[in-house]
């Protein structure tokens, strides 16, 4: 039987303390570097081993970062977003969106929050 994937989208506030090597992750995205079609948002592309984000454990590769220290990341050039992180200070508050795969049901089933409906 063919299946389909449904996703649960959740938001979380993550407070990181900048470590000796920084925050410890990479990003993709921005108005000039769309990673997701029709979405200029900023996404986590790499969590570096033993970095601040990895040691905290909550930020995940694939998460969308909505804001940094309360500053919205919408409609930013990629390098402007990078600079925002680099200049964010010692204590950094991230508002992130997790997208979790929650089921793989049969075709024809429409889960709650299905964007197709």
């Amino acid at each position: 039987m063919n299946g389909r994937v449904d996703y649960l989208v959740t938001e979380e506030e993550i407070n990181l303390t900048r470590g000796p090597s920084g925050l410890g992750f990479n990003i993709v995205g921005g108005t000039d570097q769309q990673y997701v079609s029709n979405d200029s948002g900023i996404y986590v592309s790499r969590i570096k081993e033993n970095g601040a984000a990895a040691l905290d454990g909550r930020l995940q590769e694939g998460d969308k970062i909505l804001s940094v220290n309360g500053q919205d990341l919408k409609n930013l050039l990629h390098q402007d977003a990078v600079d925002l992180f680099r200049n964010a200070g010692y204590a950094v508050s991230l508002r992130v969106q997790h997208r979790l795969q929650v089921q793989n049901g049969p075709i024809g089933h429409r889960g709650e929050g299905d964007p197709s409906g």
Epitope: G22, G24, N26, I27, V28, Y43, V82, R86
Partner: nanobody
């Protein structure tokens, strides 16, 4: 978690060619930097070639420049290493590696330039 499966290794005569493939799964391939490394008998594992997530930046070990070409096919979630004019000293186990691409939020220069997070099991290349 990223899973990497290499193929295409084998035995070839000096001067011959091989094309290694590495199929990736587990997360969007288009966001991954990819690399090929090799470990020769009794030696450390060395970087051979890398390609960034957008495909517009490559790196080659000096001794393979002009002979090896790294490329990627995002539609097939696969990275390739075309190896021409093979030499006996190219004999090694070749490993595919991956890491998330993009920009570090920490500094212009990423200290772990050749530090990769995910590794395949390797494929043997023997040049006689």
């Amino acid at each position: 978690e990223v899973q990497l499966v290499e193929s295409g290794g084998g035995l070839v005569q000096a001067g011959g060619s091989l094309r290694l493939s590495c199929a990736a799964s587990g997360r969007p391939f288009s966001s991954l930097d990819m690399g090929w490394f090799r470990q020769r008998p009794g030696k450390e594992r060395d970087v051979v070639a890398t390609i960034n997530w957008t495909g517009d930046s490559t790196y080659y070990l000096d001794s393979v420049k002009g002979r090896f070409t790294i490329s990627r096919d995002n539609a097939k979630n696969t990275v390739f290493l075309q190896m021409n004019s093979l030499k006996p000293e190219d004999t090694a186990v070749y490993y595919c590696a991956a890491r998330g691409g993009g920009s570090s939020v920490d500094s212009e220069y990423d200290v772990g330039e050749f530090k990769y997070d995910y590794w395949g099991q390797g494929t043997q290349v023997t040049v006689s």
